[in-house]
Structures are given as C-alpha cells and as structure tokens.
Interface confidence: low
C-alpha cells in the first residue's frame, strides 16, 4: 500500500525517496512519474536523473535534497487539487528486474487561508526514517539524506538537523529508503 503525504493548496508538497549509492559518485538513474509504478520505467515522467545529473524536469517539480548523496525526494511547488494522486519513485538499479519502486500517495487539502507569496520553502509531510549507511572519506559512517555526513551516533540529534534541511521535524517509520551495493 502507498504511504500517504499531505499538503495544502498553494504549499509545496514533499515526497521522500532515498537510496544509498554503492560508493561516492556511483549514482543510479531515478525517475519520478505521476501514477503508480508500471512494470518498467515511470509513466507520465515529471523528473529524471541519470548517473550524474538531473537530466529532465518539468515545471514545479524539483529535487531540493542532495541528490548526489542519494536524496531524490521530490518537491512539487505551489500544489493544486489536481496534483493529488499516486506518484512513483523508481530507482533504476542495473540488472534485470532490479528496480526499486515506491508508490507515494499525495493528498491535497484546500487551503485554510490564501497563502501569501514567500521565498521560504515550506515543506509539508514527514521525513522517512533514515537507516541506511555508507562509507565516505576517512572512516566515516553515514546516514543518507539532504544533510551531509551525519553519523549514526547522531540520530538522536536528527530532529534539530531536519529543521535546517527545511523538512518537517517529525520522524516517521515509513518512507522510500534503500541501500545499493
């Protein structure tokens, strides 16, 4: 079943998706599509990365996280009711039928008040639990996310770091996080 995320009309919606590169620089192609994940690829692609870059994106869809570290979470800017629905995050691991597929359900609620224009990016939705680690640099143990180089011993302070990453402060036990390699 899909994990559900919520946003109000006029806000930015945040749909989390993560993977852990096998080694620094070993990025895996990822696609985001509107609609549940099909057997192959993504339907109605809204954003795509390759082994080194975001190589396709459409208006209002972007990656605010640090995709170079495997944070391929999707932000949808200034959502409307029409943005409701299932979104597919597909991590295209090399090999036959190796892809990791995550269906995330976005529920858009009518705005309580008309939002004032602002440069601040207010993300709504929960941050997924971050359990995967990878090696980087001299004997560092990492967790993955838009924050660099957070040690597992620092998980207890993660809520403070999440504030800095502009994501919601509440941790959830669900979300799209996988380890590659």
């Amino acid at each position: 079943s899909e994990v559900e995320y919520r946003a109000e009309v006029g806000q930015n919606a945040y749909l989390p998706c993560f993977y852990t590169p096998a080694a620094p620089g070993n990025l895996v192609p990822v696609c985001w599509g509107k609609g549940a994940c099909p057997v192959f690829e993504c339907g109605n692609v809204v954003l795509r990365t390759d082994e080194r870059d975001v190589n396709y994106w459409t208006s209002r869809y972007w990656l605010n996280g640090d995709f170079r570290k495997g944070d391929v979470s999707l932000t949808i800017e200034n959502v409307t009711l029409a943005d409701s629905g299932i979104y597919c995050c597909r991590i295209q691991i090399p090999g036959i039928m190796n892809d990791e597929k995550f269906n995330l359900k976005l529920v858009i609620k009518p705005a309580k008040v008309t939002p004032a224009p602002t440069r601040q990016r207010d993300f709504t939705a929960a941050f997924p639990r971050m359990l995967t680690t990878r090696g980087h640099g001299p004997a560092e143990t990492q967790t993955l996310g838009s924050l660099p180089d957070i040690n597992l011993t620092q998980i207890s302070t993660l809520a403070n770091e999440l504030r800095d990453s502009r994501l919601a402060n509440d941790l959830r036990d669900s979300g799209a996080t996988i380890r590659i390699g």
């Epitope: 001299p138 660099p148 180089d149 800095d164």
Partner: antibody
Amino acid sequence: QVQLQQSGPELVKPGASVKISCKASGYSFTGYYIHYIHWVKQRPGQGLEWIGWIYPGSGNTKYNEKFKVKATLTADTSSSTADMQLSSLTSEDSAVYYCAREAWGNWYFDVWGTGTTVTVSS
Amino acid sequence: DILLTQSPAILSVSPGERVSFSCRASQSIGTSIHWFQQRTNGSPRLLIKYASESISGIPSRFSGSGSGTDFTLSINSVESEDIADYYCQQSNSWPYTFGGGTKLEIK
C-alpha cells in the same frame, strides 16, 4: 588551471540590491564531474559564514537559514557563471563575498574565488 | 548549528618553530573538518581535508590530526610566508560552519 573569477567591488546604498558573479574556468561547469558552487561571506576583520550552494546543472540550491531571505543564487550554464543577488542591503551586508567550488562527494572547498567586496553606504 | 571554537585567537612564534592550531566542535563530527589558510587580502586556500589528509601542492610542513570534537593543525617549521589567518570548517551537517580563526604572527 581551475579558476573562479569574481566581479569587481560594489558600492551600493542601503535598501538596494546587488548581484555579484563568479565565472568558472578550467573545468566543465556542468560536465560529467558534478561541481557545486558555494558562497561564503566575510565581514571586515571577521570570520567566514556559509551562505549556500547551487548546482549549476539543475539550478538546485540549498541555503543557510540565516541567508534564505537575503540571498538568491542562480547560475547561467552558457557562460559558466554563478550569481548571487543580495537584497534589502544594510551595513551588516558590507563584506567580502567569496564563491568556492565543491566537487561531488568531497564536501570541502577545493577552489575559491577572488572575492567581491560589497560596501553598503549612503 | 555546529559551533567551531578556535584557540588561541593569536599565535606568535619565531621562524623555524613548530606551531599548533586548535579547533573544537560543539558535537562529535568524526573527521569532517577541513583547514584553510587566508593571507592578508587573499582568498582562503585549502590546506588539509578530513582532519588529516594532505592536499596536493601544499607544503609537507602542514599536517592535521584529531577526530570527534578536537582537531589540530600543525606547522612543523614555520616560515615567514605562513603569516596568515587559519580557519577550520566542518562539513558534517548543514549549515556548513567555520571557526572564528587564528591569526599567526611571526616574532
């Protein structure tokens, strides 16, 4: 030789905005190897403050919360230039601003720009 | 935010002496610390990455050590060209932060 050449000094009035630029040369701005451009502030006689980064290939940005309203980072891949606009300037914004390069997966600044001095005065 | 405290604010040494700069982090950051030199009216220059890793083109008299919260930059035989400000910087978590710097003076 990798270089980050910054625009010249700026004298601006309080309340105004200013845009400073950082032109990269000696490496591929948006090539196979991913490089981020960071911006750092240094007030006279003081230390260094990180403002934020931009990845020129996608325009993705990340800001220090303290500078989220003050600074806007953009990049023009056709000219291999990263820009930073500072708005609603006050005397507190008088500083030298540096751009710096960070290679993918390294998380340190291996090349620094020449610096741009911004003076806010009426 | 992670606070980096450098001490002392000013170091005064004679040429040829060994000198050490201290950088203390407000929480454990593994080895995610980097050292920069900034000469008067110049841009910062990377000296040491990840607490102890050397940088190509930097004289071998510069070295670094430490992990967790306490880090040290050392110059084993100071030369006059080393007169500068020295900064540590952490890349353990956003926002990146710098120490307040230590000024090296030659007696």
